[in-house]
Structure formats: C-alpha cells, structure tokens
C-alpha cells in the first residue's frame, strides 16, 4: 500500500530571464527512494540515481542545474519554460510517486512564489 | 570502504583566508553531494555548504555566501573550502561529510575535521 | 531558516536504562529529519535520516520517530559506546540547521 505523500512548491512564476528552483519532498513512507526524475510534459530533465548520482539531459545542461538536496534550478528563463513540471519517485516497495508543478514565466517583474501543497 | 580525509591545523592571521582540503576515497567522488559544517564549542553545528563535484555546482548558507568558496578538482578527486576576511569568531574545527544520495543533507561519512584558528 | 530545539540539553543515565531526546522544528519539515551521534575530539556518526531509517551499521538499540515538528530519538539498553553527545537536524531543504545538541553521560 503507498502511504506516501508528495509535497511540492506548488504553481509558482518568476520572471523572464531570472531563476527558479523546483521542490518536492516525499514523506509519510519509508520506502527506499532509488531514483528522482525531474520531467517537463514528456520531457526528460535530469535524473537523481542511487548509485550514480545526478545526470542532466544534455539538451538542458546549460540552463539546468542539480539542488539543492533532490530540487533542480532552472536558470535563464523563457516564456516557453511555462509549463507543468513533474518529479517522480522510484521507490521500494511502493512504486512510483509523481509530484506537480506549474510555472508560469512572466515579462513583467510581478512574478511571486504560490503557496505549496500537497499531492498525495 | 569510505573515507574522507582531511588537510591539517590552520593558524591563521585574522583578516586573512584560508583554504582547507578534502580527499574522500571508497566511492566515485563525482557522483556525491559534499558538504562542510562548522563547529565552534558552544556554537553547535553549522552548515557552510555544498557542492556536487560532478559539475561544479554549489549551495552556500546566506551566512557564510561571500566569504566562503567551494571547489572541487575531480582529476585528484579533492574538495576545498576557502573561508576569506576570518575573524576570532571563524576559530572553530571545520568538517567535510558526504551527503547520502537520494537523502539529501543527511550525512553520513565525515571528514576528521580540520582546526582553524584565527589569532593575532 | 527552520530552528531546531533539542531537549534535554544533559541527560545522565546508566548503562542498561532506556533514554528518549526529543527535537522540536519550527516549521513542518516532514519526516526529513535525522540524528548525529559525537564523541568527544571525533567527527558526529550518522544514526536515523528519514526521522525513523537506521544508517547502515547503527545498532537496532537505536530508533528514531516522530512527524510534523516533533521527533524523538529512544535509545534502549544503553550501552558504554553510546555516551556522548547528540544532534538532530533536519535535512528538508537549506540551510540544514542542528539542534543544540544533548550531553549523554554516565550516571
């Protein structure tokens, strides 16, 4: 049975050109995490490996950064990186878990932090 | 299995820096989170920072972000912390500590420590 | 930056008795919770990450529990290795903060 929940930053915006760091926490479980995927819509990000550690798509090496802890830093932002943004858990035993985030990239300098929720 | 070794006592002149070394050995160096922590008797502990030698990427404590530099030369597999303008309240023993993969800032293998100690 | 408050700050005990610490954080930091063991002059040892998941190594004596903002660490049986002193610190996000630490000695 999967008891576990994903907390995440939630939806949040930031400005063009700036920075963000996406965040998801897996808690209530105590299953073992082997691996994190950091997903935007059906594209791969950047992976978190038990035994081999952080691997960034080459595609995004330039604007991606690993951290801190299991989040990912989005650097040099654009208009096209608004979007839905998902980390998904590989446990053992319970299975997979995928947390949510939508962020908005604005081009104003209005752009403020959501609230973070829970998806479980 | 894993060590982390590292460089010796430092006295030290205040207003000046000083640059301490961190050999780990028992694991591939790259694929690791480091952090360094100090502690200063009745201080507790503190987190400095941290760096992911697979990339060079880092994440200071606002505290300490400015004076302190994280470096990792991955072709003799070391780490160092460069910690610049000490004063007597920088005296302290410094420690590197490997973060566990996929639990981030839990620790669990640490450097002997290093003893810093700033005096005219 | 999430506080920790560790309580107590001594604890004396004698081998073979049944201790608890106890940390309290700030904010909610989910589970993400772990425990230092430190000898004196030597480098703070790995116990619990996870508020309950044992590092590799650690005695079953050991165990470590809690959610929210409350955590306890229990320690039965007390063996003479164990004395020393004891950190909590969440590792939710940064900064990771330590708690004040607790003084095990013997009664």
């Known amino acids: 049975m999967m008891t576990g929940t994903i907390e995440t930053t939630g939806n949040i915006s930031a400005e063009k050109g700036g920075s963000i760091i996406l965040q998801c926490h897996l808690s209530s479980t105590t299953a073992q995490v082997t691996q994190v995927n950091w997903e935007q819509q059906d594209q791969l990000l950047a992976i978190c490996n038990a035994d081999l550690g952080w691997h960034i798509s080459p595609s995004f090496k330039d604007r991606v950064a690993p951290g801190p802890g299991l989040g990912l830093t989005l650097q040099s932002l654009t208009v096209n990186d608004t979007g839905e943004y998902f980390c998904i858990y590989h446990t053992y035993p319970d299975g997979t878990y995928t947390g949510r985030i939508f962020l908005e990239v604005l081009e104003s300098s209005v752009a403020e932090h959501g609230a973070r929720f829970q998806i479980p | 299995q894993v060590q982390l070794q590292q460089s010796g006592a430092e006295l030290v002149r205040p207003g000046t820096s000083v640059k301490i070394s961190c050999k780990p050995s028992?694991?591939?160096?790259?694929?690791?989170?480091l952090g360094w922590v100090k502690q200063r008797p009745g201080h507790g502990l503190e987190w400095i920072g941290d760096?992911?030698?697979?990339?060079?990427?880092?994440n200071y404590n606002e505290k300490f972000k400015g004076r302190a530099t994280l470096t990792a030369d991955t072709s003799s597999s070391t780490a160092y912390m460069q910690l610049s303008s000490l004063t007597s309240e920088d005296s302290a023993v410094y420690f590197c500590?490997?973060?566990?993969?996929?639990?981030?800032?839990?620790?669990?293998?640490w450097g002997q420590g290093t003893s810093v100690t700033a005096s005219s | 930056d999430i506080q920790m408050t560790q309580s107590p700050a001594s604890l004396s005990a004698s081998v073979g008795e049944t201790v608890t610490i106890t940390c309290r954080s700030s904010?909610?930091?989910?589970?993400?919770l772990a425990w230092y063991q430190q000898k004196q002059g030597k480098s703070p040892q790995l116990l619990v990450y996870?508020?309950?998941i044992l590092a590799e190594g650690v005695p079953s004596r050991f165990s470590g529990s809690g959610s929210g903002t409350q955590y306890s660490l229990k320690i039965n049986s007390l063996q003479p290795e164990d004395f020393g002193s004891y950190y909590c610190q969440h590792h939710y996000g940064t900064p990771p903060t330590f708690g004040g630490g607790t003084n095990l000695e013997i009664k």
């Open positions: 904010e909610n930091i989910y589970s993400y």
């Open positions: 500590a490997r973060s566990r993969q996929l639990a981030s800032y839990a620790m669990d293998y």
């Open positions: 028992g694991y591939i160096f790259t694929n690791y989170w």
């Open positions: 996870n508020a309950k």
């Open positions: 760096i992911y030698p697979g990339g060079g990427y880092t």
